[in-house]
């Protein structure tokens, strides 16, 4: 069965947009006007995972690219990366665990928890133009809350 997907953009709680920074990295910065066209459009796919009444498992691909956000250990630390996949096989309903994020909605804000590394979240820095990363703390300096904008 074709996996159900939607197209969207994400902004962090400081209203920073996400853009490509080199071929395999995202960064977060404030964009206005025509510059908003630089922001990445995600293809969010609804996949199998440890779903609960509060958490919906999703995979986050980049629209029209064979790149997915994935979570792996690098130097013994959970790390967010953009991983290249075979477009013939992705997206699929049974994504490998490293590609799966638990989408959590709290007070109209979204968090994305790694399924592979519980309590690690897609995060941005307070500072401008810093890489999007996997962070192990909520409610601290780093930002783990996002809003989603649907794209047709």
């Amino acid at each position: 069965a074709p996996v159900r997907s939607l197209h969207c953009t994400l902004r962090d709680a400081q209203l920073k947009s996400l853009v490509m920074s080199g071929p395999y990295e995202l960064k977060a910065l404030h964009l206005q006007g025509q510059d908003l066209e630089q922001q990445v459009v995600f293809s969010m796919s609804f996949v199998q995972g440890e779903e609960s009444n509060d958490k919906i498992p999703v995979a986050l691909g980049l629209k029209a690219k064979n790149l997915y956000l994935s979570c792996v250990l690098k130097d013994d630390k959970p790390t967010l990366q953009l991983e290249s996949v075979d477009p013939k096989n992705y997206p699929k309903k049974k994504m490998e665990k490293r590609f799966v994020f638990n989408k959590i909605e709290i007070n109209n804000k979204l968090e994305f928890e790694s399924a592979q590394f519980p309590n690690w979240y897609i995060s941005t820095s307070q500072a401008e133009s810093m890489p999007v990363f996997l962070g192990g703390t909520r409610g601290g300096q780093d930002i783990t809350d996002f809003t989603m904008q649907f794209v047709s």
Epitope: A1, E50, S52, N53, K94, E96, K97, P118
Partner: antibody, heavy 122, light 107 residues
Framework: EVQLQESGPGLVKPSETLSLTCTVS????????VSWIRQPPGKGLEWLGL???????YYNSPLKSRLTISKDTSKSQVSLKLSSVTAADTAVYYC????????????????WGQGTLVTVSS | DIQMTQSPSSLSASVGDRVTITCQAS??????LNWYQQKPGKAPKLLIS???TLPPGVPSRFSGSGSGTDFTFTISSLQPEDFATYYC?????????FGQGTKLEIK
């Protein structure tokens, strides 16, 4: 060897809370989810909900407001609480281990307890 | 929620017969379908996972096939111990849903 065993009172009064325990062995509740299923006398199977290894829960919509599933990993026990029971909640209640195989059969159930009959009556 | 329609609801057969039970899903569930056998007063036992896979220890007279929305469970040659009720379960999406069951009786 994987085993699950349900226990709890066989009789509950209407409007009270039904409480059951599922004690497991042969696997860790840190690694595997456990589902609860019930079967009214002479009827089919109804899936109630589950608790994952992480402790996150999913409750089937019709029972969501009355159902609580929790666990004590150190005791290898999963508990089910169903509040405000009526005669319609009379059933054999089963717990079952989730297959939990990512990318293959994440949601299936492979081992079941023998079940415990709960009658709701005054 | 995904609805599972199982048929027939009951079936009479003799030892040695070939028996087929079907299950239809209300939407495409790939191969995420399990079959269980339940004897009176006992818990369901897994016979087939992922539409066609036999767990260790399940006799080879049991088989399953299908994908998408239409699934079949077959007992190639009925044995006396096979008289029981059989259920399909979709394990594709939560909430999990069962078929209504098929009671297999001795003719």
């Amino acid at each position: 060897e994987v085993q699950l065993q349900e226990s709890g009172p066989g009789l509950v009064k209407p409007s009270e809370t039904l409480s059951l325990t599922c004690t497991v062995s042969g696997f860790s509740l840190r690694d595997y989810g456990v589902s609860w299923i019930r079967q009214p006398p002479g009827k089919g199977l109804e899936w109630l909900g589950l608790i994952w290894g992480s402790g996150d829960t999913y409750y089937n919509s019709p029972l969501k407001s009355r159902l609580t599933i929790s666990k004590d990993t150190s005791k290898s026990q999963v508990s089910l609480k169903l509040s405000s029971v009526t005669a319609a909640d009379t059933a054999v209640y089963y717990c079952a281990k989730q297959t939990n195989i990512w990318g293959y059969d994440l949601y299936g159930m492979d081992y079941w307890g023998q079940g415990t009959l709960v009658t709701v009556s005054s | 929620d995904i609805q599972m329609t199982q048929s027939p609801s009951s079936l009479s057969a003799s030892v040695g017969d070939r028996v087929t039970i079907t299950c239809q899903a209300s939407q495409d569930i790939d191969m995420d379908l399990n079959w269980y056998q339940q004897k009176p007063g006992k818990a369901p036992k897994l016979l087939i996972s992922q539409a066609n896979t036999l767990p260790p220890g399940v006799p080879s007279r049991f088989s399953g096939s299908g994908s998408g929305t239409d699934f079949t469970f077959t007992i190639s040659s009925l044995q006396p111990e096979d008289f029981a009720t059989y259920y399909c379960l979709q394990s594709d999406w939560l909430p999990l849903t069962f078929g209504q069951g098929t009671k297999l009786e001795i003719k």
